[in-house]
Interface confidence: low
């Protein structure tokens, strides 16, 4: 799977969209999970309504919401009041039985609030231990990675 970068400003909301084939994933609940390390598990953050027909209803877990347009084939995740610790690699998943298919890998980057007194150029990245190779990225706001570029800069 390619990785898509979504950039948001600290303190604001970030919307992540995950398109999918609505016919292929018909009847399946969806989930948003956070990748724990390069080879680690993907820890569930929030999932759509238990009744698939009600997937359009927004469900919250803390500051993260999920809603699913099952006809149009778009899963939308909202991260409210974005914080530096929200930066990292996530997955949109389609659930079937005890298994999960990855719909999209998402790299969330948190930009400093330009109205804040800190350097407006600040950008938080996941730690170096979470490096993922060869991310082909569709830019979502202002920046896209070059093919083959590692999404996390080396830290000194």
């Amino acid at each position: 799977h390619n990785t898509t970068v979504f950039q948001g400003v600290a303190g604001q909301s970030l919307q992540v969209s995950c398109p999918y084939d609505s016919m292929k994933h018909w009847g399946r609940r969806k989930a948003w999970c956070r990748q724990l390390g390069e080879k680690g598990p993907c820890q569930r953050v929030v999932s759509t309504h238990n009744l698939w027909l009600l997937s359009f209803l927004r469900r919250w877990n803390g500051s993260t919401a999920i809603t699913d347009d099952t006809l149009g084939g778009t899963l939308t995740i909202t991260l409210r009041n974005l914080q530096p610790h929200d930066a990292g690699l996530y997955q949109c998943q389609s659930l079937h039985g005890s298994e999960a298919d990855t719909l999209r890998k998402v790299l969330v980057e948190v930009l400093a609030d330009p109205l804040d007194h800190r350097d407006a150029g600040d950008l938080w990245f996941p730690g170096e231990s979470e490096s993922f190779e060869d991310a082909h990225v569709e830019h979502s706001i202002s920046r896209s990675l070059l093919e083959g570029e590692i999404p996390f800069p080396p830290t000194s």
């Epitope: 084939d21 016919m23 292929k24 018909w26 009847g27 399946r28 609940r29 238990n50 009744l51 698939w52 027909l53 659930l95 079937h96 039985g97 005890s98 298994e99 298919d101």
Partner: antibody, heavy 123, light 112 residues
Framework: QVQLVQSGAEVKKPGASVKVSCKAS????????MNWVRQAPGQGLEWIGR????????NYAQKFQGRVTMTADTSTSTVYMELSSLRSEDTAVYYC????????????????WGQGTLVTVSS | DVVMTQTPLSLSVTPGQPASISCRSS???????????LHWYLQKPGQSPQLLIY???NRFSGVPDRFSGSGSGTDFTLKISRVEAEDVGVYYC?????????FGQGTKLEIK
């Protein structure tokens, strides 16, 4: 109307491979999962795996992992199931079967089946 | 894998009489979306299997209303209210809640 037409019977030697085809018509081929199920002589039904022709996504039963390959050609609405390293226990009738989709929710039942392809593995 | 167990394995019924086949799964067949993917198939002699009942109790198109399905969780039943000569064959229950999909061993229905 929906039709699934499979290729003819095959006789293979142990260790060889076989590739069975299933040509679909009468429905939106790309957006329905296709299954492969087999039935050994006088035995019950055994699920081998499935393929989604729209993007080639596959799921295989653990038992066949590494020996089975399913592919789809959307230009001809045909799915293929190749089984390698054949042994005598693989002698069976192989069926392709479409997954029914209904609202609300997908039923994940196999509503249309091919006529079956007998594969005989014998030295 | 989910193990499907059918009882009885064979059944001999007089035309016009009812018949019942039981199917038990080794784990719950309720999918994460709330639906239960338990289906019944009939394989008539020399033919490919055909779908009778899907999602526990829904008759597939063209299936006579003498066939009915019921159950929940791990216990399911297929009933034929009045058996006819054309109903002979092997009946299979099957689950598609979890991959790999699995089938019961089959129940052979004969006419007395």
């Amino acid at each position: 109307q929906v039709q699934l037409v499979q290729s003819g019977a095959e006789v293979k030697k142990p260790g060889a491979s076989v590739k069975v085809s299933c040509k679909a018509s009468g429905y939106a081929f790309s957006s329905s999962w296709m299954n492969w199920v087999r039935q050994a002589p006088g035995q019950g039904l055994e699920w081998i795996g499935r393929i989604y022709p729209g993007d080639g996504d596959t799921n295989y039963a653990q038992k066949f992992q590494g020996r089975v390959t399913m592919t789809a050609d959307t230009s001809t609405s045909t799915v293929y199931m190749e089984l390698s390293s054949l042994r005598s226990e693989d002698t069976a009738v192989y069926y392709c079967a479409r997954l029914l989709r209904n609202q609300p929710g997908e039923s994940y039942a196999m509503d249309y089946w091919g006529q079956g392809t007998l594969v005989t593995v014998s030295s | 894998d989910v193990v499907m167990t059918q009882t009885p394995l064979s059944l001999s019924v007089t035309p016009g009489q009812p018949a019942s086949i039981s199917c038990r799964s080794s784990q719950s067949l309720v999918h994460s979306n709330g639906y239960t993917y338990l289906h019944w198939y009939l394989q008539k002699p020399g033919q490919s299997p055909q779908l009778l009942i899907y999602k526990v109790s829904n008759r597939f198109s063209g299936v006579p209303d003498r066939f009915s399905g019921s159950g929940s969780g791990t216990d399911f039943t297929l009933k034929i209210s009045r058996v006819e000569a054309e109903d002979v064959g092997v009946y299979y229950c099957s689950q598609s809640t979890r991959v790999p999909y699995t089938f019961g061993q089959g129940t052979k229905l004969e006419i007395k």
